[in-house]
C-alpha cells in the first residue's frame, strides 16, 4: 500500500479476439426485487477525487457523529479517526456515544508508507444517502496514524468494502459490508460511479463537486450507457479478477497473460493508479511512448513524478493511445474488454504552474503486488461489486470524461482461449497482505 | 565532442523579426533523447527560456512569448532556428541556444550566445 | 505558477570560504531542480542536477541538496573561478521554464 498511488496510504494464451464472435445472451436472468432501476437518494452521495480518494458520507454513534469515509474496496476495515490529528476537522468521540461497545482488541495496520493503529469496538452505524437502515458494526477507532490521513483531503475514516479474509487483525472481524447485508433486507451488492473532473480541483470546488455515487444493494440506470459486462470474482479476499490479455491502441502486449495478474488482479477505488506488475508495466510504457512518439515527455513523467503543462485547453489527446483490458467472461472461453482514455490515465493536477496550464501526472505506474485497477480505471467505468454472485461487472460510466472523437468502451463478446491459465496461484504462506 | 553555435543578425530594428540559428556540430540533432532549446538573457538580467523543438518537430513555447516565436528545425543541416517577429526594445538580449538532456529536463549544454540589439 | 526565490541575493566571501546558496520554491518541487553557474561574458554551465546530482566534470567541491521546497547550493572551499552568478531552475513542472532570480557570489 503506498501513500499517495494507494490511498489512504497508499496507481499466446491470452485472449486473441479470433474474429469469431459469440452471440449475445439475450435472456436476462430474474432479477431480485429493488435490485435494479433508480435508487435516486443515493445517485451522487459521493464526493473527492482520484488522487486523494472519493469519500460517502456516515453517520456513528448515538446521538449520530457525522463523518466522511473514503470509500475502499481494496481493504475490509471500516475504521475511523477517533482522536485529534491536524488533518482531521472531526473525529469519532466514541465517549460521547451511549451505544459504543469496546470490543477490548487493539489493531494495527502497517503499510509500505505509513500506517494506523486503534482500538475495535462496535457502534451503530448508518448512512444518510443510502439505504434507510441502521446496522450494529465494527469500528476500528484510529488513535494513531502516520501517513495514512491526507491534508485537504476532507475524510476522515475509510470503509472497506472488500471480503473478510483481509480484515484486521484478522479475518473473524465482519467487514461493515457483511455486517449491514446481514442485519437488514439490502441485497449483497453495491455500485460504485467514480467521476474524475478531467481538470484539476481546488479545495472549494472539491467541496461543492459531486465525485460519483456509490448505489448500495443494486444498480442505477442513470448511471451508465449501454451493456453491462461481468467478469467473475477469482477468490473473495480482494475484489479479484483475471486480465486475459492488454492492448495499447489495439496492438497486443503480447505476454503471457499470466504476467498481467502476477501476483494478483484486483479493482480498487482506494488506489489513485493503474498500477501494473513490473514488466507488464515497462512493456506498456513502452508502447505508449511509441504511440506518442512525435512528442518526447521527460523521463521523470513515465515515472509519474513530473507533471507535463500544456496551455489550458490545449492537451494533445489524440497523441496519447486508448489502453484496453480484456477481462475473463462469465462464458467458458468468452472475454470482454474494457478500454480507457488518457483522459483517464493522465490525471490533472492541481495548478502549478500558471492558471494558463493544464498540468498532468502520468497516472499508471509500477507494482510489485499485482496489476490494481485503480481509480484512473473505475473512473471510465460504472462498476458493480455483484456479490451475491461472484462477480464484477463493467460499463461505460455516464460520467467518463472523454472527447468528441473517442469515448470510453466497454466491447464484447470475444473468443479467449484458457483463461483459467492467465490466473496466478499464490503460494499459501502466512503472507501479510497488507504491506505491499 | 557536441558543440552548440548560435548565429544571426546582431541589430535588428523594431516591429521586424529576429531570426537566428543554433548549428549542432560534433553529435546528430535527430538523436532522439534530447530537446534543443532557446533562452534568452537581457543585459545584467536573469533568463528567460523561450522554447524548445524536438528533432520530429514538435515545439513547446513560452507563454508569454507563443503568439510571436517559431521555433523549426531542419535536420539534413543539424540546425534549429528561431524567428521572433514585432520585437521591441524589450527583446534585446543575449541568446542562447541549448541542449535539453538528463531526462529532457535540464539544459545540459550551451552555445556561447549572440547577442541581438533591437535598435532603429 | 511555481515562483524559485533565491538568496541572498550578493554573497560576499573570500577564497577558501563556504559558500551556501538557497533556492526556495514556492510549493513543492519534488527533486527536480537544478544549479547553473554563470561567468561573465560567458553561457550558464550545469552544475548540479535531479537537486544533487553532479553534472559531468563538475568539482567534488560543488554539492546540491534538498527537496520539496528548500533547495541548498554548497562551494565547499570557494577556488578563484567559483566567483560567479549561480540560477536555479526547477523541472517538476515540464517544460523547463522557471529560473530562480540569481545569487551573485563575489571576491569580499
Known amino acids: 500500500t503506498q501513500h499517495g498511488i494507494r490511498l489512504p496510504l497508499r496507481s499466446g494464451l491470452g485472449g486473441a479476439p479470433l474474429g469469431l464472435r459469440l452471440p449475445r445472451e439475450t435472456d436476462e436472468e430474474p432479477e431480485e426485487p429493488g435490485r435494479r432501476g433508480s435508487f435516486v437518494e443515493m445517485v451522487d452521495n459521493l464526493r473527492g477525487k482520484s488522487g486523494q480518494g472519493y469519500y460517502v458520507e456516515m453517520t456513528v454513534g448515538s446521538p449520530p457523529q457525522t463523518l466522511n469515509i473514503l470509500v475502499d474496496t481494496g481493504s475490509s476495515n471500516f475504521a475511523v479517526g477517533a482522536a485529534p490529528h491536524p488533518f482531521l476537522h472531526r473525529y469519532y468521540q466514541r465517549q460521547l456515544s451511549s451505544t459504543y461497545r469496546d470490543l477490548r482488541k487493539g489493531v494495527y495496520v502497517p503499510y509500505t508508507q505509513g500506517k494506523w493503529e486503534g482500538e475495535l469496538g462496535t457502534d451503530l452505524v448508518s448512512i444518510p444517502h443510502g439505504p434507510n437502515v441502521t446496522v450494529r458494526a465494527n469500528i476500528a477507532a484510529i488513535t494513531e496514524s502516520d501517513k495514512f490521513f491526507i491534508n485537504g483531503s476532507n475524510w476522515e475514516g475509510i470503509l472497506g468494502l472488500a471480503y473478510a479474509e483481509i480484515a484486521r487483525p484478522d479475518d473473524s472481524l465482519e467487514p461493515f459490508f457483511d455486517s449491514l447485508v446481514k442485519q437488514t433486507h439490502v441485497p449483497n451488492l453495491f455500485s460504485l460511479q467514480l467521476c474524475g473532473a478531467g481538470f484539476p480541483l481546488n479545495q472549494s470546488e472539491v467541496l461543492a463537486s459531486v465525485g460519483g455515487s456509490m448505489i448500495i444493494g443494486g444498480i442505477d440506470h442513470s448511471l451508465y450507457t449501454g451493456s453491462l459486462w461481468y467478469t467473475p470474482i477469482r477468490r473473495e479476499w480482494y475484489y479479484e479478477v483475471i486480465i486475459v490479455r492488454v492492448e495499447i491502441n489495439g496492438q497486443d502486449l503480447k505476454m503471457d497473460c499470466k504476467e498481467y495478474n502476477y501476483d494478483k488482479s484486483i479493482v480498487d477505488s482506494g488506489t489513485t493508479n493503474l498500477r501494473l506488475p513490473k514488466k507488464v508495466f515497462e512493456a506498456a510504457v513502452k508502447s505508449i511512448k511509441a504511440a506518442s512518439s512525435t512528442e518526447k515527455f521527460p523521463d521523470g513523467f513515465w515515472l509519474g513524478e513530473q507533471l507535463v503543462c500544456w496551455q489550458a485547453g490545449t492537451t494533445p489527446w489524440n497523441i496519447f493511445p486508448v489502453i484496453s483490458l480484456y477481462l475473463m467472461g462469465e462464458v467458458t472461453n468468452q472475454s470482454f474488454r474494457i478500454t480507457i482514455l488518457p483522459q483517464q490515465y493522465l490525471r490533472p493536477v492541481e495548478d502549478v504552474a500558471t492558471s494558463q496550464d493544464d498540468c498532468y501526472k502520468f497516472a499508471i505506474s509500477q507494482s510489485s503486488t499485482g496489476t490494481v485497477m485503480g481509480a484512473v480505471i473505475m473512473e471510465g467505468f460504472y462498476v458493480v461489486f455483484d456479490r451475491a454472485r461472484k462477480r464484477i461487472g463493467f460499463a461505460v460510466s455516464a460520467c467518463h470524461v472523454h472527447d468528441e472523437f473517442r469515448t470510453a468502451a466497454v466491447e464484447g463478446p470475444f473468443v479467449t482461449l484458457d483463461m483459467e491459465d492467465c490466473g496466478y496461484n499464490i503460494p499459501q504462506t502466512d503472507e501479510s497482505t497488507l504491506m505491499t | 565532442q557536441l558543440q552548440l553555435q548560435e548565429s544571426g543578425p546582431g541589430l535588428v530594428k523594431p516591429s521586424e523579426t529576429l531570426s537566428l540559428t543554433c548549428t549542432v556540430s560534433?553529435?546528430?540533432?535527430?538523436?532522439?533523447?534530447?530537446?534543443w532549446g532557446w533562452i534568452r538573457q537581457p543585459p545584467g538580467k536573469g533568463l528567460e527560456w523561450i522554447g524548445m523543438?524536438?528533432?520530429?518537430?514538435?515545439?513547446w513555447y513560452n507563454p508569454s512569448l507563443k503568439s510571436r516565436v517559431t521555433i523549426s528545425v531542419d535536420t539534413s543541416k543539424n540546425q534549429f532556428s528561431l524567428k521572433l517577429s514585432s520585437v521591441t526594445a524589450a527583446d534585446t538580449a543575449v541568446y542562447y541556444c541549448?541542449?535539453?538532456?538528463?531526462?529532457?529536463?535540464?539544459?545540459?549544454?550551451w552555445g556561447r550566445g549572440t547577442l541581438v540589439t533591437v535598435s532603429s | 505558477e511555481i515562483v524559485l526565490t533565491q538568496s541572498p541575493a550578493t554573497l560576499s566571501l573570500s577564497p577558501g570560504e563556504r559558500a551556501t546558496l538557497s533556492c526556495r520554491a514556492s510549493?513543492?518541487?519534488?527533486?527536480?531542480l537544478a544549479w547553473y553557474q554563470q561567468k561573465p561574458g560567458q553561457a550558464p554551465r550545469l552544475l548540479i542536477y535531479?537537486?544533487?546530482k553532479r553534472a559531468t566534470g563538475i568539482p567534488a567541491r560543488f554539492s546540491g541538496s534538498g527537496s520539496g521546497t528548500d533547495f541548498t547550493l554548497t562551494i565547499s572551499s570557494l577556488e578563484p573561478e567559483d566567483f560567479a552568478v549561480y540560477y536555479c531552475?526547477?523541472?517538476?513542472?515540464?517544460?523547463?521554464?522557471?529560473f530562480g532570480g540569481g545569487t551573485k557570489v563575489e571576491i569580499k
Open positions: 560534433g553529435g546528430s540533432i535527430s538523436r532522439g533523447s534530447y530537446y
Open positions: 510549493q513543492s518541487v519534488s527533486s527536480y
Open positions: 531552475q526547477q523541472v517538476y513542472t515540464w517544460p523547463p521554464r522557471t
Open positions: 523543438i524536438y528533432y520530429s518537430g514538435s515545439t
Open positions: 541549448a541542449r535539453v538532456g538528463h531526462g529532457v529536463s535540464y539544459f545540459d549544454l
Open positions: 535531479g537537486a544533487s
